[in-house]
């Protein structure tokens, strides 16, 4: 029960996290104009990974896409790549984890297979979360560097009288969404890996005792003791009948519309 709960919770947390990573990647407010200690402008600038926007006091907002690849900073390209890799890995992880969920039954999938899939999706979520956190952190570092560089020459005098105000950018909402989402995906991945340990079948040693009964003969076969790794054959309390093998977990797995409840 605890395993199912941990796996289910891990899946939900990761799902929220990946939705957050997608949202952060699409958001325009990765960097926003710093309004502190700045002459108050009637124009507010903010930038995302894909376009930059200007919102005027008039209420008019204009966004322009970055219609170039080669002209963009390498760091921005790196952040884009990290976020996309995070989304792709997360999406694949979600797909894998759906089939790995203990509460969903697909055919006669064994617990060992579910354990493997749970571990795989968990690792994918962890890497996805790390990609998002890394991407957001790289962008944040870029902002901090540029912020202090622009502060150093914020007011550049021209002819003594004319001043130009350099627009400084600070952390936008997308950064916080990205950090939180990346963290959630990471936590979800860890939970999936923990759930995998519980799902992994342990092979228990039994004395080889043969029961002779009239009609059918049923034998409980022993298996050598192995540390549960989540891999290997699933021989946990397998009852060998001449009608075929079915694990205890599968005893009541009749095809029904309620299979995934």
């Amino acid at each position: 029960m605890a395993v199912t709960a941990c796996q289910g919770l891990g899946f939900v947390v990761s799902l929220i996290g990946i939705a957050g990573i997608i949202a952060a990647t699409c958001m325009d407010q990765w960097s926003t104009q710093d309004l502190y200690n700045n002459p108050v402008t009637a124009v507010f600038n903010y930038q995302g990974l894909w376009r930059s926007c200007v919102r005027e006091s008039s209420g008019f907002t204009e966004c322009r896409g970055y219609f170039t690849l080669l002209g963009l900073p390498a760091m921005l390209q790196a952040v884009r790549a990290l976020m996309i890799v995070g989304i792709v890995l997360g999406a694949i992880g979600l797909l894998v984890s759906i089939f790995a969920l203990k509460c969903i039954r697909i055919g006669s999938m064994e617990d060992s297979a579910k354990a493997n899939m749970t571990l795989t999706s968990g690792i994918m979520f962890i890497v996805s979360g790390l990609c998002a956190i890394a991407g957001v952190s790289v962008f944040a570092n870029m902002l901090v560097t540029n912020f202090w560089m622009s502060t150093a020459n914020m007011y550049t005098g021209m002819g003594g009288m004319v001043q130009t105000v350099q627009t400084r950018y600070t952390f936008g909402a997308a950064l916080f969404v990205g950090w939180v989402a990346g963290g959630l995906t990471l936590i979800g991945g860890v939970m999936m890996c923990i759930a995998c340990r519980g799902l992994a079948p342990e092979e228990t040693n039994y004395k080889a005792v043969s029961y002779h009964a009239s009609g059918h003969s049923v034998a409980y076969k022993p298996g050598g003791f192995k540390a549960s790794t989540g891999f290997g054959s699933n021989t946990k309390n397998k009852k060998i009948y001449d009608g075929g093998a079915r694990t205890e977990d599968e005893v009541q797995s009749y095809p029904s519309k309620h299979d995934y409840v």
Partner: antibody, heavy 118, light 113 residues
Framework: EVQLQQFGAELVKPGTSVKISCKAS????????MDWVKQSHGKSLEWIGD????????RYNQKFKDKATLTVDKSSSTAYMELRSLTSEDTAVYYC???????????WGQGTLVTVSA | DIVMTQSPSSLPVTTGERVTMSCRSS????????????LTWYQQKPGQPPKLLIY???TRDYGVPDRFTGSGSGTDFTLTISSVQAEDLAVYYC?????????FGAGTKLELK
């Protein structure tokens, strides 16, 4: 069609207050700030401030902070400007205006002439 | 506050003439985010509110004749009327539309010679 309706003129005594109105129509009143501009006779234009009809938040030109109070009545789509402690310096035409692209004032009321005289 | 300086204060013209008036701001009105200059031009006739002519320094408002042209960037801006008509006789104001508080120039009065 965007329209900002202001009423003619106000004759007031020095030291008193006056509240002038600006009724908006032809657009969603709460979507845009309402700005106020002063024009003394034969002189240039001075921006007084603006009010956000949604939240009733205001932004003032420091010069008019103690002179003007901007308010709105959402139900009647009307913006108000109260001028207090009036002196002859406050004799002017007061316009309400709405911003457009480029933070330009594309829509103006006809103006209210406030004359401060004993 | 941003100081807007217009010159000349008065400009005597004859109809059909090409005229140019200038406006200078004490700070650069260029927004780096969209590379637009937040400078606006208005025309005002006696007894009327100002009428928007040009925003973003060079974009004509709807219905404004193409004889009106705005140009310039940074701190120096120009309004040009290619061929002055009788109905163009008015006072022209430039406005800083970038910094609060919004400020206007003292105006250039276009009058007949």
């Amino acid at each position: 069609e965007v329209q900002l309706q202001q009423f003619g003129a106000e004759l007031v005594k020095p030291g008193t207050s006056v509240k002038i109105s600006c009724k908006a129509s032809g657009y969603t009143f709460t979507d845009y700030n309402m700005d106020w501009v002063k024009q003394s006779h034969g002189k240039s234009l001075e921006w007084i401030g603006d009010v956000n009809p949604n939240y009733s938040t205001t932004r003032y030109n420091q010069k008019f902070k103690d002179k003007a109070t901007l308010t709105v009545d959402k139900s009647s789509s009307t913006a108000y400007m109260e001028l207090r402690s009036l002196t002859s310096e406050d004799t002017a035409v007061y316009y309400c205006a709405r911003l457009y692209y480029g933070n330009s004032f594309a829509y103006w009321g006809q103006g209210t002439l406030v004359t401060v005289s004993a | 506050d941003i100081v807007m300086t217009q010159s000349p204060s008065s400009l005597p013209v004859t109809t059909g003439e090409r005229v140019t008036m200038s406006c200078r701001s004490s700070q650069i009105l260029l927004n780096s985010g969209n590379q637009k200059n937040y400078l606006t031009w208005y025309q005002q006739k006696p007894g009327q509110p100002p009428k928007l002519l040009i925003y973003w320094a060079s974009t004509r408002d709807y219905g404004v004749p193409d004889r009106f042209t705005g140009s310039g960037s940074g701190t120096d801006f120009t309004l040009t009327i290619s061929s002055v008509q009788a109905e163009d006789l008015a006072v022209y104001y430039c406005q800083n539309a970038y910094f609060y508080p919004f400020t206007f120039g003292a105006g250039t009065k276009l009058e007949l010679k």
